[in-house]
Amino acid sequence: TCEIVTLDRDSSQPRRTIARQTARCACRKGQIAGTTRARPACVDARIIKTKQWCDMLPCLEGEGCDLLINRSGWTCTQPGGRIKTTTVS
């Protein structure tokens, strides 16, 4: 299964949690560790190469996915309007 290594979590700011997470997955040829439905998963390597992050389907069902400026990551927008932002480094 995919192994999650949480490197850092910062909850000092109200209503905001910053976490840095790395996932390691045993993937098939042509795939690489990514995020699907908010879970670590093997995704097509072309998604990572082109930075079309929403093509991983990273958000939960019922949410909307949008790319950040410069394709530096993505946002998941919940039906109520709350936004979760993920940046890729």
Partner: antibody
Amino acid sequence: SLEESGGRLVTPGTPLTLTCTASGFSLSNYYMGWVRQAPGEGLEWIGIIYASGSTYYASWAKGRFTISKTSTTVDLKMTSLTTEDTATYFCARIDIGVGDYGWAYDRLDLWGQGTLVTVSS
Amino acid sequence: ELDMTQTPPSLSASVGETVRIRCLASEDIYSGISWYQQKPGKPPTLLIYGASNLESGVPPRFSGSGSGTDYTLTIGGVQAEDAATYYCLGGYSYSSITFGAGTNVEIK
């Protein structure tokens, strides 16, 4: 839900665009596909459009079929239609299920009722 | 391009019997197969994905198995309402995707 529209009787060579209207979910968070079924025959894969708008087509459909989308609709544009294109055309929502080892699998988990295209002279 | 060979094309079974439908892929698809049921005049419905994962709401008499190129859909204790045509769909959305030819299941 998904609802296809635009199917009708056309003559060979006539272009036609089918529309799939999605409601209750965001197209930005799913892939969408088109599948067709000739009368009395099996299901035939046409192509897919990803969240980003990138597309992939079955080899037989390349060049004649084009898939595009807006925030709430997915279109299938068909050109150079022949009698062999007579079929019910379905759109389907494609979700990804994550299984063992983090491997991801396609799930065509929501289908429209289909729209009938008849090509006849 | 990926080819999915589905057998048998049709079968007849009595209520309570076990039914098996096989799909053979032309290349290793790494469990990238899903199974669908279609009744006349209706769209298909998802039964199994990822070779063996049961879709929510599907009766547990349906199961899937296999790996590599060889996959099977099993209906254990078939019921009258299972009369339908069943299709496998093999491959991946970022590569080649192909349906099997279908298996028509008749209940005696």
